[in-house]
Interface confidence: low
């Protein structure tokens, strides 16, 4: 576009330019080719020799322009059509400019610090004759000249007549600029064009609100000499939470989100999530739903699974092994990463399940206790004569750390039947003498309970280091025994098993083993021992 610095046609009032001498250029009202009133300057001193008539415009601020265009519209009389003017009449005039920091006022153009610089000698492409004058055929000439680059704040134009019959119909002064624009979500300011012979002007754009460019590389465009933008390089992208709408970035509306500038559009919130605000960069999960830390923002929100279904078990007694299997939960919570975790509790044989405690490290789980993808597990090293509750919990990526202890589990309760339900530390060494040892243990079935009186105990013992095959055996009906005829200062291994008499006796294993060293002969008196 053109930025107009001076347009004489736009003035209805007197232009009031400076003419020296006073009998030279004269300001006259006229009409243009469209019969609109205009102010013109004319001079026609063609019969007198040595003409030197100057006309100086007012001060013209150059604005941001460095290369300025001067467009002149004028008529010029053909000297040959003026009788008696052959020696004195000219068919050209000169145009000058004078750069200044401020208005020179109405002084003589030649004065004022620096000399005027000549732009050009202007000749008419078409001049008019006396005949044309009679027919009102004034032939209008248009000439455009470029000046600059300018460095001062403004300038005056000056026209020198040396004896022509000329009328200045229009003086228009402008520079070309690339208009302020938005391209690729970047705003580019109005930029003055350089001359047609120079390089393009590179201009850095500013990303529009809520957008961003490549770090360290703002979008750029180039302002061409004709005032057109060319060669865009790069663009801005709407920031997270905003999407492109024409030439600006608008906030993602509620229900939509945008996680990064690299995505052009806001996306609808994934399932079971919501964005209540404008400009959301992610969607918040609804109550009871969550995302795992590894889920992307585009993932649907999910919830913990329901309990495994149809938990079944089988118990084999020799060896004592509990096998479990189950079906997947009815509701996976919307996730595919369901795993299973087992919790083993050892409970009193009677009474509420509340009287349970964790099974402890002794019990082994195959293939593992937690993180199972399989829907089956095996428990080893259970004690005979105990009651176990086993819980199988279903977990997924959004189950909390306490979920295994929560409510999304299935459970079974199993009694392992009579046997040796002791840990090693539950067998008490009551007395140790040089030749005898007294042991006692907790009854596997509480006294008075059905079957309690039928329980028998078998104690097997041998010297440590000797073959297990060289053992001795004693039996007792009570949960205590004194073994005699032992060697002093010798380490013995004792094993106990319990069973109701009958076929099941042989099915029970001797479990566990404990070691006791008899006292030396020199030891005086007896020694009571606390539980080891």
């Amino acid at each position: 576009e053109e930025v107009i610095l001076l347009d004489s046609k736009a003035s209805q009032a007197e232009l009031g330019w400076t003419a020296l001498p006073s009998n030279g250029w004269e300001e006259i009202s006229g009409v243009d080719e469209h019969d609109r009133p205009i102010r013109t300057y004319q001079v026609c001193n063609v019969l007198e020799p040595n003409q030197d008539n100057w006309l100086q415009t007012g001060w013209i601020s150059r604005g941001r322009g460095q290369r300025i265009f001067v467009e002149l519209q004028f008529t010029l009389r053909d000297c040959s059509s003026i009788p008696g003017a052959a020696g004195t009449c000219k068919e050209t005039f000169n145009v000058y400019y004078l750069e200044t920091e401020a208005d020179l006022g109405r002084g003589r153009p030649r004065l004022g610090g620096s000399r005027p610089r000549k732009i050009d000698t202007i000749a008419a492409d078409e001049s008019f004759t006396q005949g044309d004058l009679g027919e009102r055929k004034m032939k209008l000439n248009t000439e455009v000249r470029e000046i600059g680059p300018l460095s001062r704040r403004g300038f005056h134009l000056a026209f020198q007549d040396v004896g022509a019959c000329v009328a200045l119909v229009s003086v228009r002064v402008y520079y070309k600029q690339c208009r302020a624009t938005v391209r690729g979500l970047a705003t580019f300011p109005a930029t003055a064009a350089e001359s047609a012979f120079s390089t393009l002007v590179e201009v850095a754009g500013t990303c529009v609100a809520h957008s961003e460019g490549e770090p360290g590389s703002p979008p750029r465009m180039h302002c061409g000499a004709d005032g057109e933008w060319l060669v865009p390089v790069g663009r801005c992208s709407c920031s997270a939470g905003f999407q492109e709408r024409g030439d600006f970035c608008e906030a993602c509306p509620p229900g939509f989100y945008k996680v990064s500038p690299r995505r052009p559009l806001c996306s609808p919130c994934p399932e079971h999530s919501r964005a209540l605000e404008n400009a959301s960069t992610f969607c918040v999960c609804q109550d009871s739903y969550a995302r795992s830390p590894t889920d992307p923002p585009s993932a649907s929100c999910t919830r913990p699974p329901s309990a495994p279904r149809d938990l079944q078990y089988s118990l084999s007694r020799s060896p004592l092994v509990l096998r479990l299997r189950w079906l997947p939960p009815a509701d996976s919570g919307g996730r595919s990463d369901v795993t299973y975790s087992l919790l083993c509790l050892r409970c009193g044989r009677e009474g509420p399940a509340g009287a349970c405690e964790p099974c402890g490290p002794r019990v082994a789980f195959l293939p593992r206790q937690a993180g199972l993808r399989e829907r089956a597990a095996t428990l080893l090293h259970l004690r005979p004569g105990a009651r176990y509750t086993v819980r199988v919990a279903a977990l997924n990526g959004v189950s909390g750390p306490a979920a295994a202890a929560g409510t999304t589990y299935a459970q079974v309760t199993v009694s392992t039947g009579p046997g040796a339900p002791w840990e090693e530390d539950e067998i008490r060494r009551d007395r140790v003498e040089p030749q005898s040892v007294s042991l006692s243990w907790r009854e596997p079935i509480p006294a008075g309970a059905p079957g309690a009186n039928d329980t028998e105990y078998e104690i097997r013992y041998y010297e440590k280091g000797q073959s297990e095959q060289t053992y001795s055996m004693v039996k007792t009906g009570a949960p205590t025994v004194t073994v005699t005829n032992l060697k002093p200062a010798t380490r013995y291994v004792f094993q106990i098993r319990a069973a109701s008499p009958g076929p099941s006796w042989e099915a029970q294993s001797f479990n566990p083993s404990i070691e006791v060293q008899t006292l030396g002969e020199a030891a005086s008196g007896s020694r009571d021992q606390s539980p080891a």
């Epitope: 690729g184 979500l185 060319l230 999407q243 492109e244 024409g246 030439d247 509306p253 052009p264 559009l265």
Partner: antibody, heavy 121, light 107 residues
Amino acid sequence: EVKLEESGGGLVQPGGSMKLSCVASGFTFSYYWMNWVRQSPEKGLEWVAEIRLKSNNYATHYAESVKGRFTISRDDSKSSVYLQMNNLRAEDSGIYYCTFYYGSSAWFAYWGQGTLVTVSA
Amino acid sequence: DIQMTQSPASLSASVGETVTITCRASENIYSYLAWYQQKQGKSPQLLVYNVKTLTEGVPSRFSGSGSGTQFSLKIDSLQPEDFGSYYCQHHYVTPPTFGAGTKLELK
């Protein structure tokens, strides 16, 4: 999920008329310049028409080959864009896709499944 | 209107090979060029815009280059899912125009 669903295609005789519709979902329809692009074995992919936003006074642009015969319109309340095709010619045959620009960047990130228009006697 | 000339019209290649498709504009379109992939019976899918920006989800074996009037799309280490037709399109001024397409077939 962004979805564009065209309908209204079929067989029509030369000189006849037909109106295609496209229903959009999954994005703020009123913010985007909507377009029709067609594809035929003879001419390949060919942009047909564009309609801009309410703020642009619903300005329209057409390919030279359809100017004066086709009219694109939109109904933001229904998230729909239409193509009224009059004085149809054999060379107008093809699959017509509904698609849209991001802002004024004229690349087409989302396309409908297309609707087949056959102009034949 | 700006004419887009694509070459070759068809191309046979094997899985694992690298191929290049070129596109020439009849006048300067700077960096306003997009590439699309189309499988038989499906709609075109945007692969690349602004010459080299990959659309989200497009594998990095695709790369675009060029500026002004000469552009190319390179596919490294072809995968079975890469076979189909490819089209270039300028997005510089209205009307946007497309190339005639390149059909990439399995050798």
